[in-house]
Interface confidence: medium
């Protein structure tokens, strides 16, 4: 008998994770028509594809891209020009500045004369032709053609004071989730934009150390809970004759304008009809207002009977954001996701009033996103299939039929490999791409929009599959546990040679923020995968109360009392995991980032003795220190007659004494524009005042993501050492 060669597979290493060795690819077509799309190839050529004729050719060569060090591009709708983007300089989460060059595809050369200024804050083509709108130094400019002189639309722009066509910090992060705040009408005639006035907003100032003798000070108008908010106005300008009539302001609905309010989104319905969404500062009332252009008045009119109110009686309006409408071909009726009578978010069809809305989907699951509405179909995603909240499948509802018939497009395509999808549709959904994120290896495919037939595999991550063949990956389970009347879904990552009769250290990874979801059927090879694979640690992620897609009763449980149930439910889960018999009760840790850092800190300070140690990265420590739009959405106002008491009770600092019997590692970037270093500074101060020992690490000049290569390597190495020490694992 020959001796067996044993298991030749190796465990993951921390280096694998830090080098991104096992990262996956997705393929999103850049649609330019019903059947044509562009895609940037591996070697940076921009390639044109026609699905029907099967032709493909390079529309823009990598040498042209390289000549200006371009990293991105945008084709004009008339296909005559391409903008090339270079000198990318990140600002906040979505915003960045860049240099733009216009390349003339007909002549094969860059457009000279009236070159664009630099750096530009935002630039986009009109939906038709090749008009350009761009934002430079907080003002909006228009070019009728790339070679034409620019026309200045706004003059009020001023750094940190007035923003035109781009959001200020809080709107970018907490309301729009975009770098832009301007929208072309479908025919390119009108340009709508928002003006944000931050003149009265308090400034957050922090040091940026750089390399100089003196640090720079970064100043950001940043409204914290209860502070003065930006003042918003929406304007629409006729881009055909911008000099004849200036920008026209769109009126705010009366019921909104009566107190502090937010603009939440803008959707063009047709060439002369626009839909604006507004939200009261107390974010349980949202108003959708449909406005029409009145040629005779040269104004935009928003009749009261075209105002639709959405209100929550149990929490805040919408999910994380209020959903946006998907209009029908008639440009009057629309489809929208909001809570039904049973508190589950579902698609409704609104023809005249919200009261008369027709519910399109129903059940104790949630519709998540409407991708596309065509003449006869509506495509949406939901977590309906087989009752797993952490899955996403794409459905088609045939809206021509009565009653509408529903088909799951993705449920049975690659059932084991793919349970979490998104989609990208061509203009009228003649074709679409499906991007599957897991639980198996991600795969992107192209489909016929009529028959749903798969036409082509766009990316199947073959190389990744091959390189993972000799890796011992942990086993991932998604299950649920019960406590009282509550159900908590959890994901458990088990070491490769997991043996139920043995005892393992447990690490809880938590986020837990309102309307978030951690337990998702997606593929990932990351730090926690390594900890399970190499270090033999069991990892668990639990979606407690306040998390999304399981109905409003579960979601709104945390309303006005953040920091209570999110923590309680993590503790409940840990107790249940201990009952399973394979967890070493003496070696349990918890870690989280951002909201997760807040929850992990409170869990460590719960006084339960469940945790030996834990890590908080960039934690919020008091909701008074965080952004108004976010904090107030879930907590109300920090005033005596509102919710100040819970703002005070829910701080990490209030529990400083309780950190005495745990090992705590506190980490923060000093240039965190989002969750300010102030949060960790206050935790540290409270711990010092209570004479509680703890460990800490700061990352100079790093923001909320601590994402620079060197910092990230240091961070994960440091956290690994801390954990291994806590769990008595040899290095």
């Amino acid at each position: 008998l020959r001796p067996s060669r044993g298991n030749t597979k190796r465990a993951l290493t921390l280096k694998d994770i830090l080098n991104g060795t096992f990262s996956y690819k997705t393929y999103f077509p850049n649609w330019i028509s019903e059947q044509e799309y562009l895609h940037q190839s591996e070697d940076d050529n921009i390639v044109f594809y026609n699905i029907e004729t099967r032709e493909s050719y390079i529309i823009l060569s990598n040498s042209t891209m390289k000549s200006v060090n371009a990293t991105d591009y945008g084709l004009s709708p008339d296909r005559q020009f391409v903008y090339l983007e270079s000198d990318y300089s990140k600002l906040w989460r979505y915003s960045y500045t860049a240099t733009y060059y216009i390349y003339d595809l007909q002549n094969g050369e860059f457009v000279r004369g009236y070159e664009l200024p630099r750096p530009i804050q935002y630039l986009c083509w009109s939906p038709v032709g090749s008009k350009l709108a761009y934002v430079y130094q907080n003002n909006i400019y228009l070019k009728q053609r790339p070679g034409d002189p620019p026309f200045q639309i706004t003059y009020t722009g001023r750094e940190n004071r007035i923003f035109n066509g781009i959001p200020d910090w809080v709107y970018e992060e907490e309301m729009l989730a975009t770098k832009y705040a301007l929208w072309w009408s479908p025919d390119g005639k009108f340009l709508a934009y928002v003006e944000f006035n931050d003149s009265d907003i308090p400034i957050i100032a922090y040091s940026y150390y750089g390399d100089g003798q003196y640090p720079r000070t970064i100043n950001i108008p940043y409204p914290k809970a209860g502070a003065k908010n930006p003042v918003v106005r929406v304007f629409i300008v006729d881009t055909t004759y911008p000099h004849h009539v200036g920008p026209m302001e769109v009126p705010v609905p009366e019921m909104i304008a009566s107190s502090d309010y937010y603009f939440s989104w803008l959707t063009w319905v047709s060439s002369e009809r626009v839909c604006l969404q507004w939200l009261k500062r107390v974010q349980n009332v949202s108003v959708l207002s449909i406005c029409d252009f009145r040629e005779d008045w040269h104004a935009w009119e928003c009749p009261k009977n075209q105002e639709h109110v959405e209100e929550s009686r149990t929490g805040w309006a919408g999910g994380f954001f209020v959903s946006t409408p998907a209009f029908s071909q008639d440009a009057t009726s629309y489809y929208k996701i909001f809570s039904d009578k049973d508190g589950y978010k579902h698609i409704h069809y609104i023809k005249d009033t919200v009261e008369n809305a027709i519910q399109i989907t129903s059940g104790k699951w949630e519709a998540i996103y409407i991708f596309r509405v065509t003449q006869d179909s509506l495509f949406y995603s939901s977590n309906e299939f087989e009752g797993y909240p952490g899955r996403r499948n794409i459905y088609r509802i045939s809206i021509g039929n009565s009653p509408p018939s529903k088909k799951c497009v993705t449920c049975h395509l690659r059932k084991e490999r793919c349970q979490y999808y998104t989609a990208s549709f061509s203009y009228k959904a003649k074709y679409y791409a499906l991007v599957c994120y897991g639980p198996g290896l991600p795969i992107s495919t192209l489909h016929d929009g009529r028959t749903d037939q798969e036409i082509q595999v766009l990316e199947e991550n073959k190389e990744l599959e091959n390189s993972l063949r000799n890796i011992q990956l942990p086993k991932v389970e998604i299950k649920k546990l019960k406590d009282g009347g509550l159900t908590f879904w959890y994901k458990m990552i088990l070491p490769p040679q997991f043996d139920r009769s043995k005892k393992y250290p447990l690490l809880i990874q938590v986020y837990g923020g309102p309307c978030s979801q951690s337990v998702k059927s997606v593929f990932a090879v990351n730090w926690i995968t390594y900890l399970a694979s190499k270090e033999g640690i069991v990892i668990a992620l639990v979606d407690g109360r306040g998390t999304a897609f399981q109905g409003d009763k579960f979601l709104h449980a945390v309303y006005r009392k953040l920091g209570v149930y999110e923590v309680e439910d993590q503790l409940t889960a840990v107790r249940k995991f201990i009952e399973m018999g394979f967890i070493d009760e003496e070696r349990i840790a918890i870690w989280g980032w951002s909201y997760g850092g807040y929850v992990s800190s409170l869990a460590l300070a719960s006084g339960t003795g469940l945790f030996k140690c834990g890590i908080a990265v960039a934690p919020v420590s008091s909701w008074e220190y965080y952004a108004s739009i976010y904090s107030e959405r879930f907590m109300g106002l920090p005033t005596k007659d509102d919710n100040l008491e819970h703002y005070k009770n829910s701080t990490v600092m209030a529990r400083a004494e309780y950190f005495r019997n745990v090992d705590y590692l506190l980490i923060h970037g000093t240039a965190d524009d989002n969750v300010h270093f102030q949060n960790s500074a206050q935790i540290a101060k409270a711990l010092v005042n209570a004479q509680v020992d703890f460990q800490a690490m700061w990352y100079s000049d790093q923001n909320h993501g601590i994402s620079s290569g060197r910092s990230q390597n240091h961070l994960y190495t440091h956290m690994t050492h801390f954990l291994k020490q806590c769990f008595s694992l040899s290095d």
């Epitope: 039904d340 009578k341 059940g363 299939f385 087989e386 009752g387 159900t487």
Partner: antibody, heavy 119, light 109 residues
Framework: DVQLVESGGGVVRPGESLRLSCAAS????????MGWVRQAPGEGLEWVSG????????YYADSVKGRFTISRDSSNNTLYLQMNSLRAEDTALYYC????????????WGLGTLVTVSS | EIVLTQSPGTLSLSPGERATLSCRAS??????LAWYQQKPGQAPRLLIY???DRATAIPDRFSGSGSGTEFTLTISRLEPEDFAVYYC???????????FGGGTKVEIK
Amino acid sequence: DVQLVESGGGVVRPGESLRLSCAASGFTFSSYDMGWVRQAPGEGLEWVSGIRVSGGSTYYADSVKGRFTISRDSSNNTLYLQMNSLRAEDTALYYCAKENDRHSFFEYWGLGTLVTVSS
Amino acid sequence: EIVLTQSPGTLSLSPGERATLSCRASQSVGYYLAWYQQKPGQAPRLLIYDASDRATAIPDRFSGSGSGTEFTLTISRLEPEDFAVYYCQQYYNNWPPLTFGGGTKVEIK
């Protein structure tokens, strides 16, 4: 303790009507979906109708659609089933049942009330 | 409509024996399946929900398993009070019509 007590059953002729009531106690009636399930003599269980918390959404088995109406009155913790145009095949023991707060299985059942439709 | 088929129709066993009841769904119902016990002259009683979770105060000799289309109710050691009719019920997506299986009668051999 959760209690569900059905009443209103009896003997009627085909085509006649009957209204069943279910008095609920021991739980917050307004927070739970409710349902009616019936069992013909010597047969299995058949779901008849359901009503959501709000009372705004009501559901029926095809066999009773258009003839039966479910309703609820949260002020007196009562569930109703209005049965019109009764047929011989509606003869059964009718149970009132409380659904789980998140899923449509039945956590608690009443003892039932007998409806006999006979000429 | 989702059809549930229970087998066998009748199971004749002695006290102390193991009972295995099957319920098959005409299409996947995920884990949305419950089991009930009904004794003569009594209302049904919830035993198992979500395919495998025991209801309050149900002895641990009752266990449920399965997902998708195949489900099993197991009674590890039959007690005299376990002889009854057992029904499965699907509540897939909690979306009507809710359906019950035809029942399995567990009788004393």
